[in-house]
């Protein structure tokens, strides 16, 4: 059970992760006017990866879109790649996670395959976490810079004579939105790649014993005291008694007539 | 259409105070900024403030700091002026503008309001 | 505070004439966000109040006649008046409504001949 609900928190805490990662990269307000000593101008001014916006103080709103892709600076390029390849992996990583859910059955597949599918979009969550948190950090450290360029050249214009008023940035609402949102598909990616231990079935040197009764067709498994009709496919090279103590999880990882296909 | 409706003087005594007035109509008060412009005789402009009458969120020319109140009453579609202290220097047209919606710039102005101090 | 510089002052034109005047703002009014000009040109008539001609320094208000054109960037703007008529006497203000406070030019009294 605990493996269970530790596959499926992760899974939750990833789509939310992953959801946020996709609204932070779509956000506008990635950098925003500073207007730390009251407003300096009468438009707010703030910038996304993909467009800037100008919101007169009206309230009208005009958003331009960066038309270019050369003359952008590398940073904001590399910001996008990042934040892209993290949305990418991520909804491929939900894609695998999906199918490697213990609550959800598709045809006949082995628990290793699911543990094999949970390990899988684990990695790809946390890549994508990371993804998200670096392409944040990087923009973020750029805005730093820039800030304090500007607040140094703030006053100082040629050979200090002229004064100039500069538009300083700082953090927007969408850095925050990547860095938690970043750091739940990390979280996530974490709980899948515990969940995966849970789910990997433990190697044992005990083989499945069939035992025929005469008038029926019935195999019997004494490990998990769980019968199927006929001689199909999954009385064959099945482990079915490892041993040692057994978990509520891996009970339920056998098919019985309680399993909903 | 818009219309800003001022009255037409106001005669004060030095050291008094006067509030000014700008009935709007012909449009939504609490959408667009309301503007306030001083213009002493045969000089040019100068800008007070401005009052946003929505949620009464100004801003002021430090200058006219202490010197001018800017207040609006959305039951009536107003906005008020109160001029503080007044000297001669403060004897001056005073205009009440609506902020246009896609500038900063100022599209429909009242009359104008002559502010005389004298004792 | 921004300082508008304005010139000349007066400028006496006849009817039917071009006429340019100058605005100059001591510091730039574009704004890199949407490489737009707050800069705008009013023009008031004797005994009137002023009237809004043109906005975001070449953005001709409704109703204006096109012989009115403003045209500038960053610093330095200009307006004309393509073919001047009698009823444009009048002074014309420049206006920055980019920084605040707002600030006005000391105005260009165009004077016709």
């Known amino acids: 059970m605990a493996v269970t609900a530790c596959q499926g928190l992760g899974f939750v805490v990833s789509l939310i992760g992953i959801a946020g990662i996709i609204a932070a990269t779509c956000m506008d307000q990635w950098s925003t006017q500073d207007l730390y000593n009251n407003p300096v101008t009468a438009v707010f001014n703030y910038q996304g990866l993909w467009r800037s916006c100008v919101r007169e103080s009206s309230g009208f709103t005009e958003c331009r879109g960066y038309f270019t892709l050369l003359g952008l600076p590398a940073m904001l390029q590399a910001v996008r790649a990042l934040m892209i390849v993290g949305i990418v992996l991520g909804a491929i990583g939900l894609l695998v996670s999906i199918f490697a859910l213990k609550c959800i059955r598709i045809g006949s597949m082995e628990d290793s395959a699911k543990a094999n599918m949970t390990l899988t979009s684990g990695i790809m969550f946390i890549v994508s976490g990371l993804c998200a948190i670096a392409g944040v950090s990087v923009f973020a450290n750029m805005l730093v810079t820039n800030f304090w360029m500007s607040t140094a050249n703030m006053y100082t214009g040629m050979g200090g004579m002229v004064q100039t008023v500069q538009t300083r940035y700082t953090f927007g609402a969408a850095l925050f939105v990547g860095w938690v949102a970043g750091g739940l598909t990390l979280i996530g990616g974490v709980m899948m790649c515990i969940a995966c231990r849970g789910l990997a079935p433990e190697e044992t040197n005990y083989k499945a014993v069939s035992y025929h009764a005469s008038g029926h067709s019935v195999a019997y498994k004494p490990g998990g005291f769980k019968a199927s009709t006929g001689f199909g496919s999954n009385t064959k090279n099945k482990k079915i008694y490892d041993g040692g103590a057994r978990t509520e999880d891996e009970v339920q990882s056998y098919p019985s007539k309680h399993d909903y296909v | 259409q818009v219309q800003l409706q001022q009255p037409g003087t106001e005669l004060v005594k030095p050291g008094a105070s006067v509030k000014v007035s700008c009935k709007a109509s012909g449009y939504t008060f609490t959408t667009y900024w309301m503007h306030w412009v001083k213009q002493r005789p045969g000089q040019g402009l100068e800008w007070i403030g401005r009052i946003r009458p929505s949620d009464s969120d100004s801003n002021y020319n430090q200058k006219f700091k202490g010197k001018a109140t800017l207040t609006v009453d959305k039951s009536s579609d107003t906005a008020y002026m109160q001029l503080n202290s007044l000297t001669s220097e403060d004897s001056a047209v005073y205009y009440c503008?609506?902020?246009?919606?896609?500038?900063?710039?100022?599209?429909?102005w009242g009359q104008g309001t002559l502010v005389t101090v004298s004792a | 505070d921004i300082v508008m510089t304005q010139s000349p002052s007066p400028l006496t034109v006849i009817v039917g004439e071009k006429v340019t005047m100058t605005c100059k703002s001591s510091?730039?009014?574009?704004?890199?966000?949407?490489?737009?000009?707050?800069l705008t040109w009013y023009q008031q008539k004797p005994g009137q109040p002023p009237k809004l001609l043109i906005y975001?320094?070449?953005t001709r208000e409704s109703g204006v006649p096109d012989r009115f054109t403003g045209s500038g960037s960053g610093t330095d703007f200009t307006l004309t008046i393509n073919s001047v008529q009698a009823e444009d006497l009048a002074v014309y203000y420049c206006?920055?409504?980019?920084?605040?406070?707002?600030?006005f030019g000391s105005g260009t009294k165009l004077e016709i001949r």
């Open positions: 206006q920055n409504d980019y920084f605040f406070p707002f600030t």
């Open positions: 510091q730039t009014l574009l704004n890199r966000g949407n490489q737009k000009n707050y």
């Open positions: 975001w320094a070449s």
């Open positions: 503008a609506m902020g246009a919606y896609f500038s900063n710039s100022f599209a429909y």
